[in-house]
């Protein structure tokens, strides 16, 4: 069952699917000046059995000007929103991702792929959030969202991540100021961040997510 909506957006944060559930579709999109080859697939589909999942179909792009140049590779990892576009990022593959049953790995890139990807997620898909560069997490509640089916409708759970660009100030005179994250910077003059305890820099995300996969701002 396809999810009706996109994963929720969080201010100053981006999300990433660590693996894609079987049934996920990725549109075959080509960059400007290129088009899908005639009779080429419209999308790639994550399919599989109990022991192995993989992307069916191949995306192939050809020059819009010439008809006989068809080079093809497989697609590239990406932070995506279902039916929404985001910029491409360099391939970063978490080591534990392949072991997730019923899920496909991030597909590697194909030649002349569009700079943005469009995924169509299915019920059960989970995406993970992290503050973009220049912002830090004020609050790190569950930093993921899951597409769930309730009462015959799909909905994504609301991540409880709050990203702020506020400058830290110590709340109590004489209190040792915790170390700010390197990205912290003043953002607003109308509210002020105060820190009362040491802040845990590493985001606590499920499934031993590696923060290094967040390499691009998507918003």
């Amino acid at each position: 069952e396809l999810c009706d909506d996109d994963p929720p957006e969080i201010p100053h944060a981006t999300f990433k699917a660590m693996a894609y559930k079987e049934g996920t579709m990725l549109n075959c999109e080509c960059k400007r000046g290129f088009r899908r080859i005639k009779s080429g697939s419209l999308y790639m589909l994550c399919t599989g059995n109990s022991s192995h999942s993989s992307w069916d179909n191949q995306c192939q792009c050809t020059s819009s000007a010439t008809r006989n140049t068809t080079k093809q590779v497989t697609p590239q990892p990406e932070e995506q929103k279902e039916r929404k576009t985001t910029e491409m990022q360099s391939p970063m593959q978490p080591v534990d991702q392949a072991s997730l049953p019923g899920h496909c790995r991030e597909p590697p890139p194909w030649e002349n792929e569009a700079t943005e990807r469009i995924y169509h997620f299915v019920v059960g898909q989970m995406v993970y959030y992290q503050c973009v560069q220049g912002y830090r997490a004020l609050h790190r509640g569950p930093a993921e969202s899951v597409c769930k089916m309730t009462h015959g409708k799909t909905r994504w759970t609301q991540p409880q991540l709050i990203c702020t660009g506020e400058m830290e100030t110590s709340q109590f005179p004489g209190e040792e100021k915790p170390q700010a994250s390197p990205e912290g910077r003043p953002e607003s003059e109308t509210s002020c961040l105060v820190t009362t305890t040491d802040f845990q820099i590493q985001t606590e995300m499920a499934a031993t997510m590696e923060t290094s996969i967040f390499t691009t701002e998507y918003q």
Epitope: P11, R140, Q158, T195
Partner: antibody, heavy 115, light 107 residues
Framework: QVQLVQSGAEVKKPGASVKVSCKGS????????MHWVRQAPGQGLEWMGV????????IYAQKFQGRVTMTVDKSTSTAYMELSSLRSEDTAVYYC????????WGQGTTVTVSS | DIQMTQSPSSLSASVGDRVTITCRAS??????LEWYQQKPGKAPKLLVY???TLAEGVPSRFSGSGSGTDFTLTISSLQPEDFGTYYC?????????FGQGTKLEIK
Amino acid sequence: QVQLVQSGAEVKKPGASVKVSCKGSGYTFTDYAMHWVRQAPGQGLEWMGVISTYSGDAIYAQKFQGRVTMTVDKSTSTAYMELSSLRSEDTAVYYCARGVTFDYWGQGTTVTVSS
Amino acid sequence: DIQMTQSPSSLSASVGDRVTITCRASQDISNYLEWYQQKPGKAPKLLVYNAKTLAEGVPSRFSGSGSGTDFTLTISSLQPEDFGTYYCQHHYDTPYTFGQGTKLEIK
């Protein structure tokens, strides 16, 4: 079920301080940040600030900076909002509200500042 | 600060009417907008979050739409229990400001 239960009404004199509590139950307290919102009689809603129930970090609206202190006690799943140097215009109902989207609210605490 | 402006400030409508309340942000807030209903002497109640997602337990006659700076809360068929004051609020950046409210009365 999710509940936010606030402390009872307070009457304070100008210049005094008030500390309002908000106890969360029915969910994992540290999963959700806690916001504080106030409403003066016959007026609209005014956001005061937010505190991370996990880390204790807080952001205050500039208007209240220097007068407000938000804290949490994870052991009792309680958030606190203390407002000092009270003046008559601080007379209001003070609410706590949970999470990014303020999906649950406390019942409100009436604070009256009067000489 | 981001200013949130609601219109109208008050309105009176009959049971069964379609009612629309609008909220305008002073800058682009994407879809980081919530709608609340408040009845006299009670705490506000979340109706819609992220501009268009209905909160759990909220009747389907309520719906939210819009993105960027212009947002709408619609009640498709007004019910007697829908009286109260409605507020929009953004969560794009601190401070999270509210609209001034729209008081809805039942004719």
